[in-house]
Amino acid sequence: IKVTTPYSLYVCPEGQNVTLTCRILDSVSKGHDANFLKTWFLSSRGEVQVCKEHRPIRNFISHHQHHRSHPAVNASHDQPQKHGLEIAYDNHGNFSITLHNVTLSDSGLYCCLVIEVKHHHPERRLYGYMELQVQTGKGSASTCTAYPPNEQDSDSITAA
């Protein structure tokens, strides 16, 4: 299992919607004994490790799991739409969060976390991260622009 980020930087004018995406590459575990816990959160670029500090996004804590007996359980505590958010996971391994009507306060480092659970044991914690920069309307573009990561930044962070 590997987590990659197609884009590492999103630059958006205020008021736009933006979809941040992590891609879960799961060639080995498909159909086997692995389950996944997934979440999105805000963080900061720590001195040692990115995505170590967890803060809720718009005061929302997302919970999503892929469990064999319940293939796609979106276990968020209330509807993300109430917070102007949408969280999605598709069959191609795209795990995304959409922020509607972004404001300057939405700027920050966004992290996706995927925990691979095998035989009830959390085997690995994999992170993907990207930065969202929200700009004031004056003189900025009318749509969001996404920038791909440098080659060395494209792989996920793994924490045992």
Epitope: N35, L37, T39, F41, G46, K52, E53, H54, P56, I61, S62, H63, Q65, H67, S69, A75, S76, H77, D78, Q79, L113, I115, V117
Partner: antibody, heavy 119, light 107 residues
Framework: QVQLQESGPGLVKPSDTLSLTCTVS?????????WNWIRQTPGKGLEWIGH???????SYNPSLRSRVTISRDTSKNQFSLKLSSVTAADTATYSC????????????WGTGTTVTVSS | EIVLTQSPATLSLSPGERATLSCRAS?????IHWYQQKPGQAPRPLIY???YRTTGIPARFSGSGSGTDNTLTISSLEPEDSAVYYC??????????FGGGTKLEVK
């Protein structure tokens, strides 16, 4: 093996400040995890008081926020609880526990210490 | 704050029987965690993230549910399962909240 041990006075007078310390062995409190205080009473059951994170940021139960301070002493690998203006309703067994960021459950607990508020 | 209501408050069953403990949330929660507490001891984590047993927990313990209704099942009771069982959520935070507990007697 990670161990947590609470210490502090077992008897506190009404209106005084309750002070407890949790000593952590086998793991550095600055490495990871959130370090929590939880109390248990026969009437209210288990109640989360608040926590301090590995980086030193704190979060408190809104119902107690005005009276609670959680701090840490990294040199001693300890974190502490102060609860001011105590009343008989604060009589409880106080425990410290650690929780990993996501999926947020308490995996290691201290044995707990009983605090009675009485004059 | 999200209130977790556990039922039944007490449950008395015989060894080998199946126990079903309920944890109902006042509004939809993410994961539910379950703990076992015996007299004079600290709570011991049993199940995390609704489904998953923590290290050393026998397979007779299982968790299920989603949204507002979650269940802890003990498939074949042993005398040492006598304890108080608590559920906990960290979805709406702060505060983290616990259920009021179910006291299970196996005799």
């Amino acid at each position: 093996q990670v161990q947590l041990q609470e210490s502090g006075p077992g008897l506190v007078k009404p209106s005084d400040t309750l002070s407890l310390t949790c000593t952590v062995s086998g793991y550095s409190i600055t490495s990871d995890y959130t370090w929590n205080w939880i109390r248990q009473t026969p009437g209210k059951g288990l109640e989360w008081i608040g926590h301090i994170t590995y980086s030193g940021s704190v979060s408190y139960n809104p119902s107690l926020r005005s009276r609670v301070t959680i701090s840490r002493d990294t040199s001693k690998n300890q974190f502490s609880l102060k609860l001011s203006s105590v009343t008989a309703a604060d009589t409880a067994t106080y425990s410290c526990a650690r929780a990993l960021y996501y999926p947020w459950y308490f995996d290691v607990w201290g044995t707990g210490t009983t605090v009675t508020v009485s004059s | 704050e999200i209130v977790l209501t556990q039922s039944p408050a007490t449950l008395s069953l015989s060894p080998g029987e199946r126990a079903t403990l309920s944890c109902r949330a006042s509004s939809s929660v993410g994961y539910i965690h379950w703990y076992q507490q015996k007299p004079g001891q600290a709570p011991r984590p049993l199940i995390y993230a609704t489904y998953y047993r923590t290290t050393g927990i026998p397979a007779r313990f299982s968790g299920s549910g989603s949204g507002t209704d979650n269940t802890l099942t003990i498939s074949s009771l042993e005398p040492e399962d006598s304890a108080v069982y608590y559920c906990q959520q960290w979805s709406s935070y702060p505060p983290i909240t616990f259920g009021g507990g179910t006291k299970l007697e196996v005799k």
